[in-house]
């Protein structure tokens, strides 16, 4: 019997999407590239439920983790990597006093129980997101033996 598995190995399913929490660290731009290499996107948050899920993953592992949000295009104007602006209701997730742009901090990370802005050239963990496979279609992903992970091989 073939079991349907909506996400590749080592990815986590949540509300119709697959998420990969990296085990290595890269700067923000390289994190974008790493996600693109596996057909995903550095995570763009669309709902409070998704934010709560991701914040929990990040805080549980006690890691500073990049998300797909920056104000690189225009200082103070935060934009997701899909081009959409940071919406009003998501501003509540910034940690107290953030974003503060101390020393050109233009990229957003999960930090503790909220978000922080930090220097984009710093190496941090990252989260990729892509749509889950539908189990009713031909291209469904059945427990593949080859994990698709956007991590470089160990040195």
């Amino acid at each position: 019997e073939r079991l349907c598995h909506p996400c590749p190995w080592e990815w986590t399913f949540f509300q119709g999407n697959c998420y990969f929490m990296s085990n290595s660290q890269r700067n923000w731009h390289d994190s974008i590239t790493a996600c693109k290499e596996v057909g995903a996107q550095l995570v763009v948050i669309k709902s409070a439920e998704e934010q709560n899920f991701l914040q929990l993953q990040s805080s549980r592992s006690n890691r500073f983790t990049w998300m797909g949000l920056s104000d690189l295009n225009q200082e103070g104007t935060w934009q997701w990597v899909d081009g959409s602006p940071l919406l009003p209701s998501f501003k509540q997730y910034w940690n107290r006093g953030e974003p503060n742009n101390v020393g050109e901090e233009d990229c957003a990370e999960f930090s503790g129980n909220g978000w922080n802005d930090d220097k984009c050239n710093l190496a941090k963990f990252w989260i990729c997101k892509k749509s889950a496979a539908s189990c009713s279609r031909d291209e469904e992903q059945f427990l593949s033996p080859a994990p698709a992970t956007p991590n470089p091989p160990p040195a």
């Epitope: 119709g16 997701w80 919406l87 009003p88 501003k91 509540q92």
Partner: antibody, heavy 119, light 112 residues
Amino acid sequence: QVTLRESGPALVKPTQTLTLTCTFSGFSLSTSGMSVSWIRQPPGKALEWLALIDWDDDKYYSTSLKTRLTISKDTSKNQVVLTMTNMDPVDTATYYCARMALRHAFDAWGQGTMVTVSS
Amino acid sequence: QSVLTQPPSVSGAPGQRVTISCTGSSSNIGAGYDVHWYQQLPGTAPKLLIYVNSNRPSGVPDRFSGSKSGTSASLAITGLQAEDEADYYCQSYDSSLSGWVFGGGTKLTVLG
């Protein structure tokens, strides 16, 4: 009790600039999480979102009308102002202001003001 | 043409159950953005009926319920009453348009 009230001209001529004022009470636009939006509805047609301003003074505009719209706020007067340039008869509509609290739902609306564009 | 597609009209007899669909795409409902529903009685401003997919503001009867799945959402009204006759609009956010979007509206007629 949250209330919003729109005011402005009932009639404008083509090519003129429309200025609408939303005066509200029962909440403050300096409170985190609060936003005010403008939405319009041509006679017998659907609702169309135009612009939004939040407590942080960040402004959001409809892509198709961005070049014609300006939204601003006067927190001390509890007012939000929308200006729309180069008015055309197709802009004839009822214009509403509405509050948006968290989660992006418009939870309180003004009664609307009808604006006719005609020469 | 609205970004969110609703049937132009639905009807039902008093006491019946009707549903109104709202179909979007991967850049709005399918992306995970919340869906809200509004009721607009004739000659009045819209009123929030359902927020965040399935929640009712205080004062809205439990005859009204909302749900969301994939790229679509739906509003269900049970025990239809004459005063439910109105236009109903769904609303979400669209990341491609970078703006809030409404459905084209559905006119509910209560028969009899």
